[in-house]
């Protein structure tokens, strides 16, 4: 009898362990990716940034995948996505080709199943970076809450990539799962 | 027999109560700190802001500590950190000594065990605030997802502190725990 | 005896199912509302934006209500609130009435019980949008962690609404519940 009760308890224990693990916060996917400045494209055109760190300094990833410059969702859910992009120029880097700049970021979602790319968030500013000043700086921050499905990919596009600030505290993006899909 | 079963059930109940409490959202640390303008330093140099409210208006804190101008982590975890910093100047507030300004924020983490300070996030802009305009305003927002250990401290550094907007809706920073460390 | 044990187990199972459901992430309220550009007010004055999508494109809502231009809280809790507001102007849209602009956003909370409205977050910038440039753009992002009670309403006010970017990736606001109130 006592043995049978223990078996029942183990069943209760076991089933609840699964449920508890699922409901616990430790399995929630996240990523914080920081710019890899060794491979920033040049030019002033809009480009997709493909080189990011995922495992050094502040960069980290769990239950998501980073591949081919894209952050891949492994687990359906609602995620908070964010990006911080810093642009800078010092006169010692040479003259700017133009003083009128569009400094922009686009956070895009690509679905493999239905090959398509959509912009989730954008931000930025037009700037007049005059030659009268020896140093210029500008940062953009965007963030929002989105439904993401397994296999979908998040990527970052910017204008004027050659002006990106390469510091890990300056140019980064990330995501963390907040909630399951009902 | 029935008594024994109840004892078993109580054991199950008890152990699960602990687990559930841990997995429930109500014990998650958070803080939202708003600027205390009675003690903003002057100057144009970069300074650490040490005066923040934690218990009035929108300001609040739970399972974290505010001490000596720093937000102290009491519980290991992954946290979303954010800061909103507003700068403003009206011509009645005094004449600007320069039109070329660097308006910046740095969110830093200090580890007591290994005495070191590192910038987690930065943002801002160089601005040209001409005397031709009677009012100037600029806001910075930064946010990101970071692993924080108990005892680590978060602080805010800004340039040009005398230009800070002292409103609680303007200049604030905060954190909330999203996830345990595996 | 075995039947009795199963009943005990069912009781344990049942009570824990409730607790687990409560502690699980799937019941957490959220909203991501995108601008409805068919009804943006004109002018340069500060206005409350009342037209938002809640069920098309990236817009979505769960366990919160959208009514009369306001996001209504249905469940007490601590929420992360955010807004991204983009302003833009192209010379083909006609000349600006003034080159000196205040481009601002205010995230406000209204309590019905005690009729009052308070600004939770603000952001923006004064801008000089010269006629020398054919296109101008500027984005604001704000975010913060706030205690919200059932029945309270969140709304968005902006200056210069006629300059708003009507894209769903540009102008939006949202909220998600992070934690219960103790």
């Amino acid at each position: 009898g006592s043995q049978h009760i223990r078996a029942e308890k183990a069943m209760v224990d076991g089933s609840w362990l699964d449920l508890a693990k699922r409901s616990k916060l430790e399995a929630q996917p996240f990523a914080h990716l920081t710019i890899n400045a060794t491979d920033i494209p040049s030019g002033s055109h809009k480009v997709s940034l493909s080189s990011w760190y995922h495992d050094r300094g502040w960069a980290k990833i769990s239950n998501m995948t980073f591949s081919n410059g894209k952050l891949i969702v492994n687990q359906d859910g609602f995620y908070y996505l964010y990006a911080n992009i810093c642009f800078r120029h010092h006169e010692t880097s040479g003259d700017l080709a133009t003083e009128y700049l569009q400094l922009m970021v686009y956070v895009t979602k690509t679905s493999i199943k239905i090959p398509s790319s959509h912009t989730l968030m954008k931000g930025g500013s037009t700037k007049y970076w005059s030659g009268n000043s020896e140093f210029h700086f500008y940062s953009i921050n965007v963030g929002g809450f989105f439904k993401l499905r397994s296999g979908e990919e998040i990527s970052i596009e910017v204008s004027n990539p050659s002006l990106l600030d390469p510091d890990q505290d300056a140019t980064y993006f990330g995501a963390f799962k907040v909630r399951d899909i009902d | 027999g029935s008594q024994h079963i109840r004892a078993e059930k109580a054991m199950v109940d008890g152990s699960w109560l602990d687990l559930a409490k841990r997995s429930k959202l109500e014990a998650q640390p958070f803080a939202h700190l708003t600027i205390n303008a009675t003690d903003i330093p002057s100057g144009s140099h970069k300074v650490s802001l040490s005066s923040w409210y934690h218990d009035r208006g929108w300001a609040k804190i739970s399972n974290m500590t505010f001490s000596n101008g720093k937000l102290i982590v009491n519980q290991d975890g992954f946290y979303y950190l954010y800061a909103n910093i507003c700068f403003r100047h009206h011509e009645t507030s005094g004449d600007l000594a320069t039109e070329y300004l660097q308006l910046m924020v740095y969110v830093t983490k200090t580890s007591i065990k290994i005495p070191s300070s590192h910038t987690l996030m930065k943002g801002g802009s160089t601005k040209y605030w001409s005397g031709n305009s009677e009012f100037h305003f600029y806001s910075i927002n930064v946010g990101g997802f970071f692993k924080l250990r108990s005892g680590e401290e978060i602080s805010i550094e800004v340039s040009n502190p005398s230009l800070l907007d002292p409103d609680q809706d303007a200049t604030y920073f905060g954190a909330f725990k999203v996830r345990d460390i595996d | 005896g075995s039947q009795h044990i199963r009943a005990e187990k069912a009781m344990v199972d049942g009570s824990w199912l409730d607790l687990a459901k409560r502690s699980k992430l799937e019941a957490q309220p959220f909203a991501h509302l995108t601008i409805n550009a068919t009804d943006i007010p004109s002018g340069s004055h500060k206005v409350s934006l009342s037209s938002w999508y809640h069920d098309r494109g990236w817009a979505k809502i769960s366990n919160m209500t959208f009514s009369n231009g306001k996001l209504i809280v249905n469940q007490d809790g601590f929420y992360y609130l955010y807004a991204n507001i983009c302003f833009r102007h192209h010379e083909t849209s006609g000349d600006l009435a003034t080159e000196y602009l205040q481009l601002m956003v205010y995230v406000t909370k209204t309590s019905i019980k005690i009729p009052s409205s308070h600004t939770l977050m603000k952001g923006g910038s004064t801008k000089y949008w010269s006629g020398n440039s054919e296109f101008h753009f500027y984005s604001i992002n704000v975010g913060g962690f706030f205690k919200l009670r059932s029945g309270e309403e969140i709304s968005i006010e902006v200056s210069n609404p006629s300059l708003l970017d009507p894209d769903q990736d540009a102008t939006y606001f949202g909220a998600f519940k992070v934690r219960d109130i103790d």
Epitope: - | S42, H89, D95, A97, T98, G131, N160 | -
Partner: antibody
Framework: EVQLLESGGGLVQPGGSLRLSCAAS????????MSWVRQAPGKGLEWVSG????????YYADSVKGRFTISRDNSKNTLYLQMNSLRAEDTAVYYC???????????????WGQGTLVTVSS | EIVLTQSPGTLSLSPGERATLSCRAS???????LAWYQQKPGQAPRLLIY???SRATGIPDRFSGSGSGTDFTLTISRLEPEDFAVFYC?????????FGQGTKVEIK
């Protein structure tokens, strides 16, 4: 050592004009805001005008707005005050003074030049 | 504009005595941004104190400043013969920058 040396003062009739100069040395002139402060005989001090380091922004006391113009030539390390439509009440010793450069807002005055006397009289 | 009123107009003291000079503002000075100057006859003013209480370079520690809001004080702990002069307060927390009318410290 920081030095400021004013010149250009003298006697002028009401409605007349005068241009004051202030030669600066001992510091990076273009990096500092500068001001003019005056002191009527036997009276207190009155701030007159200020200018940013780049010269891009200028500020004036209401009593001189529209009549006085502050300017600077950073290549010559010189500050100027062009005074037009002078009145008897503009009679004073005019000092040029350096902003400390430690704050983004123009603040105290340190150091001061020795001053130049402007007398407006018929 | 912020009006600064200094008192007394004249202070007659002997060397070695303590001098207390007052400066009252018509409204609170933002961030307590106040400075004090000393001016001797025929000379330009000299900065003594800035930021209410910070001594300028080369100023002896017998000069000290205090106060906040609308009421500020310059104290000379022990008057030396070279200290007798006119003293001005100046605020720079609001535009335009303004001065008090001065307090003359004379030898009794």
């Amino acid at each position: 050592e920081v030095q400021l040396l004013e010149s250009g003062g003298g006697l002028v009739q009401p409605g007349g004009s005068l241009r004051l100069s202030c030669a600066a040395s001992g510091f990076t002139f273009s990096s500092y805001a500068m001001s003019w402060v005056r002191q009527a005989p036997g009276k207190g001090l009155e701030w007159v005008s200020g200018i940013t380091g780049s010269g891009g922004s200028t500020y004036y006391a209401d009593s001189v707005k529209g009549r006085f113009t502050i300017s600077r030539d950073n290549s010559k390390n010189t500050l100027y005050l062009q005074m037009n439509s002078l009145r008897a009440e503009d009679t004073a010793v005019y000092y040029c003074a350096k902003d400390p450069g430690t704050t983004v807002i123009m603040s105290w005055f340190d150091p001061w030049g020795q001053g130049t006397l402007v007398t407006v009289s018929s | 504009e912020i009006v600064l009123t200094q008192s007394p107009g004249t202070l007659s003291l002997s060397p070695g005595e303590r001098a207390t000079l007052s400066c009252r503002a018509s409204q609170a000075i933002p961030y307590n941004q106040l400075a004090w100057y000393q001016q001797k006859p025929g000379q330009a003013p000299r900065l003594l104190i800035y930021g209410v209480s910070s001594r300028a370079t080369g100023i002896p520690d017998r000069f000290s400043g205090s106060g906040s809001g609308t009421d500020f004080t310059l104290t000379i702990s022990r008057l030396e013969p070279e200290d007798f002069a006119v003293f001005y307060c100046q605020q720079y927390g609001s535009s335009p920058r303004t001065f008090g009318q001065g307090t003359k410290v004379e030898i009794k």
